[in-house]
């Protein structure tokens, strides 16, 4: 049975086997087409989600679809039901928490009272002044909190206590990519991890350990990517994996936060990378122990210079490394998180591509997660 499962796929009605390599090849080899059912699926970027959270204390903003303007949500008459609606609009199913925060002196958006209409937040028509003088600070999920704060600068062995959202994404029990837990059902990784194998069956996720072989595997229900854009072949290197059964969080299995829509990180901002990738460029061996390293944001202009990536780094990507080189993510770390710590840890980037490993002028290039929030929310909403 093990041999059969490894090399063949069973079609139904009539029952017969086809070679597993015919799964997800674009041809209907089973009469009912089930060989093309459980495959990596693409999902369009979709419409603008009409709510978002700002890095200013996670304050809620609502879109007026008529004018295309964004407004800050006033705390007046804001309820748990409205908080739940806002989070559902972003695709969350967990119980949110919210609080009032004072309107700051730098408040540049108009502040409006919020109401609900057909399960979407709306601005109250006759919205007067914000009497409470407070905005809504909203958290849809308790995320980005680990048991231990990393202290080391440079490259160091990591503990799952520091990075409980890190997962190993495996095909046929072999580590292929890293990934990050975003909520009980969803793992974030890179689309290029699935180029070779587009059938969902043999992909598994392993969570809850810093050692590669030592933790149980979790079945995957769906793998979703964005439609390929031939104009920008390296763009859209992002994928979401939906787990068959929701994770139960613990000390070693917890979600990382998504970035805020306005999370603009300036050059030299400290960031962290983790992974089980190769310890040397062009070979070496995969590390059995999770490794962590501190890096920093590298200016896109510098990254696109003639002695670097010569314009290949787009608006939807970011560069990180250390100016003198030597610290970088490498093969096998693809799909893992590039992380920033404000109050919570946020996944601001996904390990995507680069030339070599750790060169001074060619740092790692990462998918900029904030550029894909809308897509993530639309995928989640479609799957709620």
């Amino acid at each position: 049975k093990v041999i059969l499962d490894k090399y063949y796929f069973l079609c139904g009605q009539p029952l017969h086997f086809i070679p597993r390599k015919q799964l997800c090849d674009g041809e209907l080899d089973c009469p009912l087409g089930e060989d093309e059912e459980h495959c990596v699926k693409s999902f369009p970027e979709g419409p603008a989600v009409a709510v978002r959270l700002s890095k200013d204390r996670s304050t809620l903003q609502v879109l007026d679809s008529a004018t295309g303007n964004w407004f800050s949500a006033c705390f007046d008459n804001f309820t748990e039901a409205l908080a739940e609606t806002a989070c559902r609009q972003m695709g969350y199913s967990s119980k949110p928490t919210f609080r009032a925060v004072e309107i700051g002196p730098d408040q540049d958006l108009d502040v409006v009272e919020i109401t609900e209409n057909s399960q979407e937040l709306r601005m109250r028509n006759s919205s007067g002044p914000c009497l409470s003088g407070s905005l809504v600070s909203l958290h849809c999920l308790a995320c980005g909190k680990s048991l231990k704060t990393p202290r080391v600068v440079g490259v160091e062995e990591a503990s799952v206590d520091s990075w409980p959202w890190q997962v190993s994404i495996q095909y046929d029990k072999q580590h292929v990519c890293g990934g990050s837990i975003l909520d009980p059902h969803w793992v974030l990784t890179a689309a290029h991890c699935f180029r070779k194998h587009t059938d969902v069956f043999n992909w598994k996720v392993r969570a809850g350990s810093d050692k590669l072989g030592s933790f149980p595997s979790l079945a995957v229900a769906k793998i979703i990517i964005i439609e390929f854009n031939p104009m920008y072949p390296k763009d859209n290197d992002i994928a979401l994996m939906k787990l068959q059964f929701p994770l139960t969080f613990s000390g070693t299995v917890r979600p990382i936060c998504l970035p805020f829509f306005d999370e603009e990180l300036t050059p030299a901002t400290p960031l962290w990378i983790i992974g089980w990738g190769f310890t040397k460029q062009n070979g070496g061996k995969m590390s059995d122990i999770l490794l962590q390293a501190s890096v920093q944001v590298i200016d896109s202009t510098r990254c696109n210079a003639d002695d670097a990536y010569q314009g290949e780094v787009t608006e939807k990507m970011m560069c990180a490394g250390i100016p003198e080189g030597g610290v970088d993510t490498c093969q096998g770390d693809s799909g893992g998180p590039l992380m920033y710590q404000s109050d919570q840890w946020h996944v601001v980037g996904i390990v995507s591509w680069g030339y070599g490993c750790g060169g001074p002028s060619t740092p790692g290039v990462y998918t900029k997660v904030s550029a894909y929030l809308n897509w993530i929310y639309n995928v989640w909403k479609a799957e709620l």
Partner: antibody
Framework: QVQLVQSGAEVKKPGSSVKVSCKAS????????ISWVRQAPGQGLEWMGI????????RYSPSFQGRVTITADESTSTAYMELSSLRSEDTAVYYC????????????WGQGTLVTVSS | EIVMTQSPATLSVSPGERATLSCRAS??????LAWYQQKPGQAPRLLIY???TRATGIPARFSGSGSGTEFTLTISSLQSEDFAVYYC?????????FGQGTKVEIK
């Protein structure tokens, strides 16, 4: 509603061990960590350790490492704290407390169990 | 481990007055700070977590502020049921640690 019900008061001799239980109800037991916190008479609160029933992972305070063992039985939704090599200064009320939502603060507490260590 | 220090040890306040309790961490705990209230013979009760978020069912007269190493719990107008001992707890990293407590008593 969430409830944590602890076992009754204990009197123990120095050098012996005590095992206190904490039965949880009103929520999914494996979904939250259970910590143990103690309070000596007239003193403040002291965290001893935590168990995550989802994977039975435990973490202990260095002050109690080697002397405390926290376990959980998912079938009965019960957590246990065993403290060994008891001395008179372990006389305290021992509380179990539920960790809330992966953020390590305690939203529900047991009623407390008084452990008296006396020869 | 992170040491939490509360001040004052005792605060004497008249009913209806404002009470301000302080808590200092020996190193940054970001916003991972909780406040608990404990009355004699009872288990502690969660008031505030994440430095400023009120727990379910906690009256609006309780508010928390601060981040990093300096935190404050404010009770805007003390009611008779608020006279108790208040503890801060950092929930930023293990081992979790508590302050030694501030007793709020009737003046």
């Amino acid at each position: 509603q969430v409830q944590l019900v602890q076992s009754g008061a204990e009197v123990k001799k120095p050098g012996s061990s005590v095992k206190v239980s904490c039965k949880a109800s009103g929520y999914t037991f494996r979904g939250s960590g259970i910590s143990w916190v103690r309070q000596a008479p007239g003193q403040g609160l002291e965290w001893m350790g935590i168990i995550y029933p989802a994977d039975s992972e435990t973490r202990y305070s260095p002050s109690f490492q080697g002397r405390v063992t926290i376990t959980a039985d998912e079938s009965t939704s019960t957590a246990y704290m065993e403290l060994s090599s008891l001395r008179s200064e372990d006389t305290a009320v021992y509380y179990c407390a539920r960790e809330s939502s992966s953020w390590d603060y305690f939203d529900y507490w047991g009623q407390g169990t008084l452990v008296t260590v006396s020869s | 481990e992170i040491v939490m220090t509360q001040s004052p040890a005792t605060l004497s306040v008249s009913p209806g007055e404002r009470a301000t309790l302080s808590c200092r961490a020996s190193q940054s705990v970001r916003s991972y700070l909780a406040w608990y209230q404990q009355k004699p013979g009872q288990a502690p009760r969660l008031l505030i977590y994440g430095a400023s978020t009120r727990a379910t069912g906690i009256p609006a007269r309780f508010s928390g502020s601060g981040s990093g190493t300096e935190f404050t719990l404010t009770i805007s107008s003390l009611q008779s049921e608020d006279f108790a001992v208040y503890y801060c707890q950092q929930h930023g990293s293990l081992p979790l640690t508590f302050g030694q407590g501030t007793k709020v008593e009737i003046k």
